[in-house]
Interface confidence: medium
């Protein structure tokens, strides 16, 4: 349309842009003046005036005219005399402009460069929390770390005060993000407080005073997982092996592991001598690809390693025939994860495997025939179970084997009979049943003086870090249609909070992005224990029916009615997904009342038996506890 | 006195080109920007552009960017408008006016009327 | 581009009388409007600029008003040489714009 202003809008565009690239706008032959009020820099959200007076020798401007970045401005112009015009801004939220402003002169035809000025607006820095500062081992410096808070979009400097309990001295440091500093400029000792003071151009804030000891912030030297090799031995054993070039005498590690379609990952815990390479045995599943990763912290002492990198390993598909079959199910069960149990080291009692895979097997071929007969005729299907009943071992449809009747268990299946008394809905959701038990031990000794929970540039471990108790139980509950998503469970006592996290993770410094594990998650966050995902509103696997486990809250102290109306009126959840673009574990969301009745936590530990898959039987049988009453 | 004064009638093939000439008197010529109008027969009148003779900027109408092109040469005080690809359409008077520094064209050329006709 | 609507198109007045001819633009053109007078056969002449200026030379009887799109052009009182066409010119935006024109004759 506008031949002419697009014409001359170009060539200002390109005479700023060049005037900028010899020096910046600041430096741009002005003629006349431009002026920001309030100023320069300021808060973001607040108006603003951008004030521009001409001074061009024979020329008594027509018109003043604003650009921003290049974009020319129609509204809130103001003219306020011959020479000045003001610009107005409402609530101004661009952390960053150039402005510059031009005037219409009588004997140019095209407009005049007045003058320009960068303009940018932010936050005053937040109090630096979060303080931590390590010793990499071999590394030779103290790297100090803190959570700088909310974006500034400003520039915010950052002056690390490092002060000698013993001397009184201060050093201080200067620094955009992070810092390191020299262990050989600490000259005072090994005691220090330091602190950070965080500076912009709209405010200053300073953190809490943090009290070290160069002793206790050593991290050891990298642990490294160099190979991995599966023994086809009668059950096949997984040997890893890694090492650490650390000289620090006394260290724990940890090593995780999952299957990689997984996601939670399973802990062993080992005191280590790294005078030579190390050998963990596993015994893990065939033919599934495998996730290891380890680190190590100086026993006793606040800080971690980061997780190594992942090391993958697929164990083979060679092993015995018969164990083969006992994870043939998964076409039975809807693809729901074949039942095991771990612990720290994974030894296993045999004795009465035979008998046990025997029956199994008879079983499974029984439950082929019935499928068949029951697909064609329902009445039969009815009448056939009550037979059934009597000639298959009462714990296959009982209890977890060894489990002394879980409440959890009987209250699953007591609320799936219940649920399921209305056929119509049976097609709407599987019943849930709890498939896998964990135990993950969890160290015993934790240093207590450090109570703050450690976000920033460290890892938050994707496992529950309170060691509240000897032992957590990770209990499996069901994404209905789409196979089991892990849950991770930490059952607290009243008043317990998993802010107050009595050990810190370092991670390995990338400043200034943070990462979860492998980098997958740009932000640091905390999950909660339980946590239910949709991948998609719109499809009816994603109908939650919270009734399922309202019977749950039943149980004396773990029933209140207020929550048990809640549950009942509430039958179906939408969940929002936190962030498109964040890999967050998709968890089932679950009230605390739940949690802490799902939680087997003075009960006697499961065996380490292997056990038939309850699961199985549960889409086939599921009034198997009616009929047994 | 201040003048603009422009030469003319001119009876042109379709096709050709013309190149209007305005001279200006009477005033110191790099200081004001030179503009030109059109005027079909019993037409109103359209801006067709405009150059500034000191700085060399010009400025067109859309309209007639691929018709027009404005020059000018300061030594005789001249502005010149070329018109190319003549049509019956390009029939018209063609003035030059002065723009001055309050912002208004204050004097105007007589006019060239541009005949295209085969 | 800026659209400038002139109205009337033609009038008759008679001497002595008061006219007043109107230019709508279609948006705001900050009061940057000149008027121009053209008899026939001859160079248009300015009258008005800025809205309400009078062009140096101009008779008093020739006023301007108007701002944002609506300005109108008065002869508070007609006389003979008054006749011809009046055209308005907004200079706000670039490419300027002309009104249709309003053709001024006795009755």
């Known amino acids: 349309m506008n031949q002419v202003t697009i014409q001359w809008d170009a060539v200002i565009a390109l005479y700023i842009l060049f005037s900028w690239c010899h020096g910046g706008i600041t430096n741009i032959n002005c003629s006349g003046h431009i002026w920001v009020e309030p100023a320069t820099i300021f808060k973001m959200g607040m108006n603003i005036s951008i004030y521009c007076q001409a001074a061009i020798k024979n020329c008594q401007p027509r018109k003043l005219h604003f650009y921003k970045n290049g974009i020319k401005e129609r509204f809130q112009i103001t003219r306020i005399n011959k020479t000045t015009a003001r610009l107005w801004y409402k609530n101004f939220l661009e952390p960053h402009a150039s402005m510059y402003c031009t005037a219409e002169c009588p004997k140019h035809f095209q407009e005049t460069l007045i003058c320009g000025k960068d303009i940018s607006s932010g936050y005053p820095p937040d109090i630096p929390d979060e303080v931590t500062c390590v010793i990499y081992e071999y590394s030779g410096n103290m790297t100090c770390t803190w959570n700088a808070g909310k974006l500034t979009y400003i520039d915010t400097k950052y002056v690390v005060h490092v002060k000698s309990l013993e001397t009184e001295e201060e050093q201080q440091y200067l620094t955009s993000s992070y810092i390191n500093i020299s262990t050989d400029s600490l000259q005072g000792g090994k005691k220090y407080l330091v602190w950070v003071q965080a500076a912009n151009a709209l405010g200053m804030e300073e953190s809490k005073q943090l009290q070290i000891h160069l002793d206790d912030i050593v991290i050891p030297s990298a642990a490294v997982i160099s190979r991995a090799e599966t023994i086809n031995a009668t059950v096949p054993k997984t040997i890893i092996y890694w090492d650490s070039q650390t000289t620090i005498e006394k260290v724990s590690c940890e090593m995780r592991y999952k299957a990689t379609t997984n996601q939670t990952w399973n802990v062993k815990e080992f005191d280590t001598n790294f005078t030579y390479v190390q050998q963990s045995e596993f015994y893990l599943e065939p033919n599934i690809k495998y996730v290891f990763q380890v680190r190590c912290q100086e026993t006793g002492k606040r800080y971690w390693q980061p997780w190594s990198s992942l090391f993958f390993h697929k164990t083979p598909e060679t092993v015995p025939q018969v164990t083969s079959k006992a994870f043939q199910h998964d076409t039975w069960n809807s693809g729901l994860t074949v039942a095991s149990i771990s612990t720290g080291h994974l030894t296993s009692d045999n004795r009465g495997d035979i008998g046990l895979l025997l029956g199994m097997i008879v079983f499974a071929v029984m439950l082929s025939i019935l499928s068949l007969i029951g697909i064609f005729n329902r009445s039969f299907r009815t009448g056939i179970k009550r037979r059934i009943l009597l000639l298959i071992p009462k714990w296959l449809y009982e209890d977890i084997p060894n489990m002394k009747n879980s409440n959890v268990v009987k209250m699953l299946q007591e609320n799936s009979e219940l649920m399921n008394n209305n056929s119509s809905e049976q097609v709407l959701y599987v019943d849930p049943m709890i498939t896998e038990i964990k135990e993950i031990f969890i160290p015993e000794h934790k240093p207590t003086d450090y109570k703050k929970e450690n976000t920033g540039p460290l890892e938050t471990r994707d496992y529950p870090q309170n060691s509240l108790f000897d032992n957590t139980t990770v209990v499996y509950i069901p994404d209905l249609n789409t196979g089991y998503k892990p849950q991770i469970s930490n059952f607290l006592p009243e008043g317990s909070h998993l802010s107050n996290n009595n050990e810190i993770t370092s991670l390995t410094l990338k400043p200034p992005v943070d990462s979860l594990d492998s980098g997958n998650n740009p932000r640091l966050q905390k999950h909660p224990n339980f946590a239910f995902s949709v991948s998609s509103v719109n499809s009816l696997s994603n109908t939650i029916f919270l009734g399922e486990l309202s019977l749950i809250l039943n149980q004396g102290e773990c029933s209140s009615p207020d929550i048990q109306n809640s549950v009942e009126e509430e039958t179906t959840m939408l969940l929002e997904n936190d962030s498109p673009s964040e890999t967050i574990p998709e968890q089932t969301l679950l009230p605390d009342e739940f949690v802490s009745c799902l939680g087997i936590v003075n009960e006697e530990l499961p065996s380490i038996n292997t056990y038939f898959p309850q699961n199985i039987l549960e889409s086939h049988f599921n009034r198997i506890s009616l009929l047994e009453k | 006195e201040f003048q603009l004064q422009q030469f003319g009638p001119e009876l042109l093939k379709p096709g050709a080109s013309v190149k209007i000439s305005c001279k200006a008197s009477?005033?110191?010529?790099?200081?004001?920007?030179m503009h030109w109008v059109k005027q079909s027969h019993g037409k109103s009148l359209e801006w067709i552009g405009g150059?500034?003779?000191?700085?060399?900027?010009?400025g067109y109408n859309g309209k007639f960017k691929d018709k027009a092109t404005l020059t000018v040469d300061k030594s005789s005080s001249t502005a010149y408008m070329e018109l190319r690809s003549l049509t019956s359409e390009d029939s018209a008077v063609y003035y030059c006016?002065?723009?001055?520094?309050?912002?208004?064209?204050?004097?105007w050329g007589q006019g060239t009327t541009l005949t295209v006709s085969s | 581009d800026i659209k400038m609507t002139q109205s009337p198109s033609s009038m008759y007045a008679s001497l002595g009388e008061r006219v007043t001819i109107t230019c709508k633009a279609s948006?705001?053109?900050?009061?940057?409007l000149s008027w121009c007078q053209q008899k026939p056969g001859k160079s248009p002449k300015a009258l008005i600029y800025?809205?309400?200026s009078l062009v140096d030379g101009v008779p008093s009887r020739f006023s301007g008003s108007g701002s944002g799109q609506d300005y109108s052009l008065t002869i508070s009182s007609l006389e003979y040489e008054d006749m011809g066409i009046y055209y308005c010119?907004?200079?706000?935006?670039?490419?300027?714009?002309f009104g249709g024109g309003t053709k001024l004759e006795m009755k």
């Open positions: 009477g005033y110191t010529f790099t200081d004001y920007i």
């Open positions: 010119l907004q200079y706000d935006e670039f490419p300027y714009t």
């Open positions: 006016a002065r723009f001055n520094n309050y912002y208004y064209f204050d004097y």
């Open positions: 150059i500034s003779p000191n700085y060399g900027g010009t």
């Open positions: 948006q705001d053109i900050n009061s940057y």
């Open positions: 800025r809205a309400n």
